[in-house]
């Protein structure tokens, strides 16, 4: 006696009694006619006709996954035995958003864990969230297709001032965090030198901070504060700024010796090191990835290098000696 | 005025060298990366090398690294670009190349045609 | 290499409407700090590149506003509000978020 012992005779399933033989025969030698497959799936294994006892699986297309039982039985009645099985989504699509937002990253397809953020023109702001993670097939938080662009209260409150000052008469004055800064303004992620720590503020708040000499604020980038590239690129950074002899005025930002001010989006965009003028006498002392050779190098060409996130070793400030 | 004047260009049979220099003006040479980039007959632009400020530093595109060699003269305001091994399909206008805060590729040179071909 | 694909490679516009040029890059150009070097140039005939549009969306010196740029991650478009007869030539788009640096295959606009 075994109990592996079936007399060749394959079963249906693992969790059921009757064989194969066992079902009742109709007429169909012939076995089955290829099975129609799920919405986004198709049959592996293809062939017009398929044998009784035969299995088929189901795959599904690119950016799709199987969710159930992905194998078809040819049962002798020449029809198919198949549990529940679709293909899910494990993408999600471009959200459907009203023009005047604008999506970044612009992709047909994003996968799960990626972010988009939507923006507004100059002088609005998202009535909402900005930022959406891809999770699952869907949208977290869900995406509103009626989510549009509001009149930012910034703007309309600083007249022809800076921003973080408000119109008062005839000149211009700082905002105050407490009495101006109570409507809805844009988050921002943001470091406070004294105490060492970043936190996430609203950017009325932040500008109000700013403008009334609050120097030890430093701007790390639009959203909330999240751990990543972005935030510890930030504040690598607001350490490096110390020494930049370039600080100019760009939106929330200051942009530094290694940056420009991008005319379109008031954001600092890093150069890239052939861009790098020569001049200045910020120079500091570095071993490039893995070399074991020391090299001098200007602040800005510092800056390009570690925005762009390559490994480089700070040995002293100032030239090599050797 | 930013000036870059490209000259050395010629036919050259495969395998043979070619020197190609630009000569600049119009602003401190010895204050700017340089580069290299070229463009085959009826296609499109190719990234050959970029320089740094005094030639310690040099970055080439995959097809011409061991065989091309990038160097300056900042006495002489003058970028060269030394071709050896050459092949058909450098057969391309060779332009010389400034950046600027705006790209790194701001500034263009009229460009000196080389030729490979038997 | 990042492959920059243009659309149309080939263009015929009417002067005083407006054209738009489509480039796509076979990765995003995003980088992990939000920067995107997406750069635009034109070549008219018989002469060297040079540079309209830099970083997306922002007009080179002294370029005319009837171009703009825009596009995210990637997709990108060059837009000429109202042609002119001086916008013709040949059309590139240039990635240098990842090295090495690439072009696109260029798109070239003609006046109707």
């Known amino acids: 006696f075994s109990i592996m012992e079936n007399n060749g005779q394959p079963c249906i399933n693992d969790d059921e009694e009757m064989k194969e033989v066992d079902l009742p025969e109709i007429e169909a030698d012939s076995g089955c006619p290829q099975p129609v497959p799920p919405e986004n799936g198709f049959i592996r294994n293809e062939k017009q006709l398929y044998l009784v006892g035969e299995d088929v699986e189901i795959s599904c297309l690119t950016g799709f996954e199987t969710v159930g039982y992905q194998y078809f039985r040819c049962l002798p009645d020449g029809t198919w035995r198949q549990g529940d099985v679709e293909c899910q989504r494990t993408e999600c699509i471009k959200p459907v958003v009203q023009e005047v937002l604008t999506i970044t990253p612009f992709q047909r397809l994003y996968r799960i864990g990626e972010s988009i953020e939507l923006t507004c023109p100059k002088g609005f702001v998202v009535a909402g969230p900005s930022r959406y993670t891809c999770q699952g097939n869907s949208w977290t938080p869900p995406i509103s297709n009626s989510l549009t662009c509001e009149k930012d209260t910034l703007t309309k409150l600083k007249g022809h001032c800076q921003l973080g000052q408000k119109q008062s008469g005839s000149e211009c004055i700082c905002m105050s965090p407490e009495e101006d800064c109570s409507h809805h303004s844009e988050d921002l992620c943001v470091f406070d030198t004294d105490s060492n720590d970043y936190f996430t503020s609203p950017a009325c708040k932040f500008l109000a901070e700013k403008c009334l000499n609050n120097q030890q604020l430093h701007f790390l980038h639009i959203g909330s504060c999240q751990d990543g590239r972005q935030l510890e690129w930030g504040l690598e950074r607001t350490r490096l700024s110390s020494n930049s002899t370039k600080k100019e005025s760009c939106g929330y930002d200051t942009c530094y010796d290694w940056e420009k001010c991008s005319a379109s989006t008031s954001k600092c965009v890093c150069l890239l090191p052939p861009q790098c003028f020569k001049g200045g006498n910020q120079l500091y002392c570095v071993k490039m990835g893995s070399s074991t050779s020391e090299k001098t190098l200007n602040i800005c060409e510092v800056g390009t290098i570690r925005c762009a996130n390559r490994k480089m070793e700070i040995l002293h400030p100032g030239k090599c000696l050797a | 005025e930013v000036q870059l004047v490209e000259s050395g260009g010629g036919l050259v049979q495969p395998g043979g060298s070619l020197k190609l220099s630009c000569a600049a003006s119009?602003?401190?040479?010895?204050?700017?990366?340089m580069a290299w980039v070229r463009q085959a007959p009826g296609k499109g632009l190719e990234w050959v090398a970029t320089?740094?400020?005094?030639?310690?530093?040099?970055y080439y595109r995959e097809s011409v690294k061991g065989r091309f060699t990038i160097s300056r003269d900042n006495a002489k305001n003058s970028l060269y670009l030394q071709m050896n091994s050459l092949r058909a399909e450098d057969t391309a206008v060779y332009y010389c190349?400034?950046?600027?805060?705006?790209?790194?590729?701001?500034?263009w040179g009229h460009g000196t045609l080389v030729t490979v071909s038997s | 290499d990042i492959v920059m694909t243009q659309t149309p490679l080939s263009l015929s516009a009417t002067p005083g409407q407006p054209a738009s040029i489509s480039c796509r890059s076979s990765?995003?150009?995003?980088?992990?700090?939000?920067?995107?070097?997406l750069y635009w140039y034109l070549q008219k005939p018989g002469q060297s590149p040079q540079l309209l549009i830099y970083?997306?969306?922002d007009l080179g010196s002294g370029v005319p506003d009837r171009f703009s740029g825009s596009g995210s991650g990637t997709d990108f478009t060059l837009k000429i509000s109202r042609v002119e007869a001086e916008d013709v030539g040949i059309y590139y788009c240039?990635?240098?978020?990842?090295?090495?640096?690439?072009f696109g295959q260029g798109t070239k606009l003609e006046i109707k």
């Open positions: 190349a400034r950046p600027s805060t705006e790209a790194l590729f701001a500034y």
């Open positions: 119009g602003f401190t040479f010895s204050d700017y990366y």
């Open positions: 320089i740094n400020y005094d030639g310690s530093s040099t």
């Open positions: 990765q995003s150009l995003l980088n992990d700090v939000g920067n995107t070097y």
């Open positions: 970083l997306v969306s």
């Open positions: 240039m990635q240098a978020s990842h090295a090495p640096y690439t």
